[in-house]
């Protein structure tokens, strides 16, 4: 969480951003909130990116003003226009690319004053893992697959029964480059699994952490997946 204050003495407003991560090839949200104003026409929102000459996005007098927008963001950005009046200056970013990573500034002007806050935006690829029993294998084997990750993550297996056990000797992980030559498919196989146990496949890089759980009993198989973005701390 980053909170910024205006720099014009008593005419300052609080602007708050949250560091976030974008999944390449999908929509991203750059979060920013501010002290609301009662008149939409008095609010100006400017998004800037460090190292980029033009603006990322500008919204003023109740509508988008894109005359100064940088070419790399053309047709890829929008604010939530109906939420600006309540203090939401968050930016929607289309088709997130690796090159969108960097430091962004959310700069706000209202009738109460000015304020800004920076936001660190990371980009990569992350996806939910799915764990299945591999019936093709000669022994009881689990297969954990996740379709898109970047940068290359680490994969760790854990089990409820054997807590703290190191499964690196009885697992094998491979990374297969996807067709676009950026992201990779993660496949990890765990051998010699026992019945009536819950196993977890944990995939993690510096952007996200995902877990796929599987509980295997004699009568049923239960699965659960979870993904969490690893937001960087305030600077």
């Amino acid at each position: 969480l980053i909170i910024g204050f205006g720099i014009s003495g008593r005419h300052s407003i609080t602007v708050t951003t949250v560091a976030s991560a974008g999944n390449i090839g999908e929509d991203g949200i750059l979060s920013c909130t501010f002290e609301p104003d009662i008149k939409l026409s008095d609010i100006v929102i400017q998004w800037l990116k460090e190292g980029v000459l033009g603006l990322v996005h500008e919204f003023k007098e109740g509508k988008d003003e894109l005359s100064e927008q940088d070419e790399m963001f053309r047709g890829r950005t929008a604010v939530f226009a109906d939420q600006v009046i309540v203090g939401n200056a968050s930016l929607r970013l289309k088709n997130v690319q690796l090159t969108d990573a960097g430091t962004y500034k959310c700069y706000i002007i209202t009738s109460k004053g000015k304020g800004n806050a920076n936001l660190e935006y990371k980009t990569g690829a992350f996806s939910m893992p799915e764990v299945n029993v591999d019936y093709n294998a000669s022994s009881e084997t689990l297969r954990c697959e996740a379709p898109r990750w970047f940068p290359q993550p680490t994969v760790v297996w854990a089990s409820q029964v054997d807590q703290g056990a190191n499964f690196s000797e009885v697992s094998n992980t491979s990374f297969e480059l996807n067709s676009e030559n950026v992201t990779m498919k993660v496949v990890s196989v765990l051998y010699n699994v026992t019945i009536n146990n819950t196993y977890s496949c944990m995939i993690e890089n510096d952007i996200a952490k995902a877990t796929g759980d599987i509980k295997v009993t004699e009568s049923e198989i239960k699965r659960r997946s979870h993904l969490q973005l690893l937001n960087s701390k305030a600077s």
Partner: antibody
Framework: EVQLVQSGAEVKKPGASVKVSCKAS????????IGWVRQAPGQGLEWIGD????????NYNEKFKGRATLTADTSTSTAYLELSSLRSEDTAVYYC??????????????WGQGTLVTVSS | DIQMTQSPSSLSASVGDRVTITCKAS??????VAWYQQKPGKAPKLLIY???TLQPGVPSRFSGSGSGRDYTLTISSLQPEDFATYYC?????????FGQGTKVEIK
Amino acid sequence: EVQLVQSGAEVKKPGASVKVSCKASGYTFTSYWIGWVRQAPGQGLEWIGDIYPGGGYTNYNEKFKGRATLTADTSTSTAYLELSSLRSEDTAVYYCARLDGSSYRGAMDSWGQGTLVTVSS
Amino acid sequence: DIQMTQSPSSLSASVGDRVTITCKASQGFNKYVAWYQQKPGKAPKLLIYYTSTLQPGVPSRFSGSGSGRDYTLTISSLQPEDFATYYCLQYGNLLYAFGQGTKVEIK
């Protein structure tokens, strides 16, 4: 309600130009991209290009670059497609469509009724 | 430029059938694939966008899925009003591109 109303059918000779209009209502014209798509008789849809009326920014299908010109008149909320050096294979129904997502170029969510352009000597 | 290869080009089906239409992108990956329905003499109608999001007012028998280069439109139980031509659209890149279309006919 979003509405896009296009100009009437046109018959043109090879080598001539045609200008098709698309009048928008029911939303803020300057805040959404407008795309143009054509469909030759019995054929599929072909994307021509799009324009952001709030700034006049355009994108064109390489196939139509230099021959298609997209413009917008914000005072009348009207978008225009002009196609020059017409040939018989340009005979098609030309559609305008609003792109969803405001300044963000989304999918085409609202369409005009289409304008038939016939190129014949 | 990204090309969208749609298949099949036509199919015959009966009311109640499950119908699947696929589109394959020539390169890249993103979720920006939309599906349209078009009936003779009419403008196309948006059914699905962002791979799987149903446009308001579109019946839930229509669904979209896919990732990477492969995308699918499924009609779970074909209704008489669904006989039409369907197109996919790739709108993630600067240049948009339609698939060639799939005509769904009555068997």
